[in-house]
């Protein structure tokens, strides 16, 4: 008789999840010499220990503490790029501008990027059928708590000028309910961070509006200013040209506004 299994609303654990995490860890530590001392088996053991045998709606930040500790790394605190709802462009940017880092350029972010995982209470099985959805089931699920935890730590580590890439095509350019709006903004340390600079990425070719005047950007400015951090905003009218100019800054067309 098949054992009754909780059906959640979200997709199940990514197939070959353990192998994927381990392989990503090995690849990352090979590419990044400063992380060669990391024992990827221990990293996997810590990752697994955070959610295996636990109810997938009852995960805490403390469950991830061993993983956070084992995966801690040195990222230049003044080279941090946050993003909201525009992950692909942010990653394309840091692939070119190699001295800047998104969360997914760190070991822990790289391990979990685009993956889903959860376990089941009192069994050592990984649930490949379904996992809790943040809205429909519960917010304290393994994936959401992981990203909340790593995002908080990433933001806490930032200093000087912190950049954030925002999607100008969305109705809420700054969304208080996004990870950036609900976690990272509130964990920037005013004693370390001087300025948050928002880059608003335009979607339409002919869109010449100043999206820095958008009400949600003004809301972000207000939140940041209240935290004693300066705020600045730039429109990126042509993201394709923007990336091209990051690659070739000496190009003559790169002196004009992008």
């Amino acid at each position: 008789v098949p054992r009754w299994r909780q059906q959640w609303s979200g997709p199940g654990t990514t197939k070959r999840f353990p192998e994927t995490v381990l392989a990503r860890c090995v690849k990352y530590t090979e590419i990044h010499p400063e992380m060669r001392h990391v024992d990827c088996q221990s990293v996997w053991d810590a990752f697994k220990g955070a959610f295996i045998s636990k109810h997938p709606c009852n995960i805490t930040e403390e469950d991830y503490q061993p993983l956070m500790k084992l995966g801690t790394q040195t990222v230049p605190c003044n080279k941090i790029l946050l993003w909201s709802r525009i992950k692909d462009l942010a990653h394309q940017f840091t692939q070119v501008q190699r001295d800047m880092f998104t969360l997914e350029d760190t070991l822990l972010g790289y391990l979990a990027d685009d993956l889903t995982w959860c376990g089941e209470f009192n069994t050592s099985k990984i649930n490949y059928q379904s996992c809790p959805d943040w809205r429909k089931d519960c917010s304290n699920n393994p994936v959401s708590v992981f990203w909340k935890t790593v995002s908080r730590r990433f933001a806490e580590a930032a200093c000087d000028v912190v950049h954030v890439m925002l999607n100008g095509s969305r109705s809420k350019i700054f969304d208080k309910n996004s990870t950036f709006g609900s976690v990272e903004v509130h964990n920037l340390q005013p004693e370390k961070v001087q300025t948050l600079e928002a880059w608003v990425i335009h979607g339409g070719r002919e869109d010449s509006r100043d999206l820095c005047q958008d009400p949600t950007i003004k809301e972000l400015e207000s939140i940041i200013s209240k935290r004693n951090i300066q705020f600045s905003c730039k429109n990126i009218y042509r993201p394709d040209k923007f990336l091209q100019c990051v690659k070739n800054p000496e190009d003559s067309s790169c002196t004009s506004e992008i």
Partner: antibody, heavy 117, light 107 residues
Framework: QVQLVQSGAEVKKPGSSVKVSCKAS????????IEWVRQAPGQGLEWMGD????????DYNEKFKGRVTITADESTSTAYMELSSLRSEDTAVYYC??????????WGQGTLVTVSS | DIQMTQSPSSLSASVGDRVTITCHAS??????LGWYQQKPGKAPKLLIY???NLHTGVPSRFSGSGSGTDFTLTISSLQPEDFATYYC?????????FGQGTKVEIK
């Protein structure tokens, strides 16, 4: 080889502060946590807090929150533990140790701090 | 805080004896347990990390086992230099905590 060398013994008055140093060598200082542990005379081991020198991450035992500050100087590969508002029960040997797989693989020789009026 | 309880608190044994020390955690600590040896006036030395991994340079007569809440340190054949106090330590959650120690004395 990995070595942690701590500063010398200190005698302090109640209410004052002490700052113990821990100089690391033989490994990349910024890649490993430094833990601080103390041991009162004839007693067991008590974890105080730690620091990841490369990112300045720190965690403290709530018992010492507000009284202990852990810092690190990357340029000299030295970690520091400062304990303020000293009282007689803070008399102990203070150790630094390097973190490894959530344990502590190499230890300093210890620094005896005596708090006495 | 996670409580770590070692037993026995002391034991007398002879050279060549097999010695077993246990450590119980008040909650699940997975495999995040270290064992240390300390001699009078000296700093602790790591013997075992991650419950069962032998630290570099530690003799193979030392071994560790367990996961979850119950752990064991075994010395297969006690040597004169093994008379010391042994501590377990959990690294699962802050604050890290140690057992109260087990003193191994000469019979």
């Amino acid at each position: 080889q990995v070595q942690l060398v701590q500063s010398g013994a200190e005698v302090k008055k109640p209410g004052s502060s002490v700052k113990v140093s821990c100089k690391a060598s033989g490994y990349t200082f910024t890649n490993h946590w430094i833990e601080w542990v103390r041991q009162a005379p004839g007693q067991g081991l008590e974890w105080m807090g730690d620091i990841f020198p490369g990112g300045g991450y720190t965690d403290y035992n709530e018992k010492f929150k507000g009284r202990v500050t852990i810092t690190a100087d990357e340029s000299t590969s030295t970690a520091y533990m400062e304990l303020s508002s000293l009282r007689s029960e803070d008399t102990a040997v203070y150790y630094c140790a390097r973190g490894r797989d959530l344990a502590m693989d190499y230890w300093g020789q210890g620094t005896l701090v005596t708090v006495s009026s | 805080d996670i409580q770590m309880t070692q037993s026995p608190s002391s034991l007398s044994a002879s050279v060549g004896d097999r010695v077993t020390i246990t450590c119980h955690a008040s909650q699940n600590i997975n495999v995040w347990l270290g064992w240390y040896q300390q001699k009078p006036g000296k700093a602790p030395k790591l013997l075992i990390y991650k419950a069962s991994n032998l630290h570099t340079g530690v003799p193979s007569r030392f071994s560790g086992s367990g996961s979850g809440t119950d752990f064991t340190l075994t010395i297969s054949s006690l040597q004169p230099e093994d008379f010391a106090t042994y501590y377990c330590q959990q690294g699962q959650s802050y604050p890290y905590t140690f057992g109260q120690g087990t003193k191994v004395e000469i019979k």
